[in-house]
């Protein structure tokens, strides 16, 4: 999916008002220095591509993020503010959600959500030069 035509300001508002808090809740008890940010993005569409991938694509050691509150809110934000997203992505993410029965917070998941926090922060500062 091409995130170029999304309403970035609305997505940013949703992140600031609620998604960011859910990410912090998920990471509670974890030191902010515990994980190094290894995933980066260069502009807002690229950031959303990476956010979508890390949030909804199962990875080795972490297959349960799609059921988390921040993931549900991310999906809702992309569905309403990215034209055509629902038709191309929702069924795929629904299938992943159904495939996972239990919510298990592994260290790998914590690392992945830490990466997500970094991607979202980068999404909110699109004019910063890439480090």
């Amino acid at each position: 999916y091409d995130f170029t035509n999304c309403d970035f300001e609305k997505i940013k508002a949703a992140y600031l008002s609620t998604i960011s808090k859910d990410l912090i809740t998920y990471m509670s008890g974890t030191k902010s220095t515990e994980f190094n940010n290894t995933v980066s993005c260069s502009n807002r569409p690229h950031c959303l591509t990476e956010i979508q991938s890390l949030t909804f694509n199962p990875t080795a050691g972490c297959a349960s993020l799609a059921k988390e509150m921040f993931a549900m809110k991310t999906k809702a934000a992309l569905a309403i503010w990215c034209p055509g997203y629902s038709e191309t992505q929702i069924n795929a993410t629904q299938a992943m959600k159904k495939a996972r029965k239990s919510k298990v917070t592994t260290n790998k998941c914590l690392e992945q959500v830490s990466q997500l926090q970094g991607l979202w922060r980068r999404f909110n500062r699109p004019l910063l030069k890439q480090q």
Epitope: A77, C82, P83
Partner: antibody
Framework: QVQLVQSGAEVKKPGSSVKVSCKAS????????ISWVRQAPGQGLEWLGV????????NYAEKFQGRVTITADTSTSTAYMELSSLRSEDTAVYYC?????????????WGQGTLVTVSS | QSALTQPPSASGSPGQSVTISCTGS?????????VSWYQQHPGKAPKLMIY???KRPSGVPDRFSGSKSGNTASLTVSGLQAEDEADYYC???????????FGGGTKLTVL
């Protein structure tokens, strides 16, 4: 029972505000879109705006920007639409409508409607 | 952005078919497969009849069908019945700003 129940009819003076409520039951309120649509007497349907309670960030039709405020309270599964600076042309039946989960632009469940009459 | 364009009225005899058109632009009907149709009887709330151009919600008779060509969407009611007499509204997604546009409505009369 899956339904949207709206507050009762209102009579308002020009220049004042009206706040209409829409209580949801029988479904998970947060992840659906709640849109507000109005219908003036003998006229067609007109979309005012939408909110996804889970996110709390509303989208408004350009025509009503600055005059309409849509909010949602997930603890009571209730959405609200407030319209300010009322004029006689705002006399209409106001409907809340549920936008399907993640497909917010078609409305598969409607409230019974609230008649708002603006008259001096 | 103005409303989608529908004919104000349409009619047919019981058992016949009638088609209602809905014309928009590239930025609404033509740009997305997000057209829906609503039926409204006098004094009642609208009811979803067709969504995503041609899908029917459960409980809607298969006499109701939808299609799209370019910037124009159509609703066809076949085997007309007396209870089909109502106002019909088309609707289309129109981007993240305008979001939803409605047609002006078509009054369907069963003769």
């Amino acid at each position: 029972q899956v339904q949207l129940v709206q507050s009762g009819a209102e009579v308002k003076k020009p220049g004042s505000s009206v706040k209409v409520s829409c209580k949801a039951s029988g479904f998970t309120f947060g992840s659906y879109g709640i849109s507000w649509v109005r219908q003036a007497p003998g006229q067609g349907l007109e979309w005012l705006g939408v909110i996804i309670p889970l996110l709390g960030v509303p989208n408004y039709a350009e025509k009503f920007q600055g005059r309409v405020t849509i909010t949602a309270d997930t603890s009571t599964s209730t959405a609200y639409m407030e319209l300010s600076s009322l004029r006689s042309e705002d006399t209409a039946v106001y409907y809340c409508a549920r936008g399907a989960e993640y497909f917010y632009w078609y409305f598969d469940l409607w409230g019974q409607g609230t008649l708002v009459t603006v008259s001096s | 952005q103005s409303a989608l364009t529908q004919p104000p009225s349409a009619s047919g005899s019981p058992g016949q078919s009638v088609t209602i058109s809905c014309t928009g632009s590239n930025s609404d009907i033509g740009g997305y497969n997000r057209v829906s149709w609503y039926q409204q009887h006098p004094g009642k709330a609208p009811k979803l009849m067709i969504y995503e151009i041609s899908k029917r919600p459960s409980g809607v008779p298969d006499r109701f069908s939808g299609s799209k060509s370019g910037n124009t969407a159509s609703l066809t009611v076949s085997g007309l019945q007396a209870e089909d007499e109502a106002d019909y509204y088309c609707s289309s997604y129109a981007g993240t700003d305008t979001f939803v546009l409605f047609g002006g409505g078509t009054k369907l009369t069963v003769l």
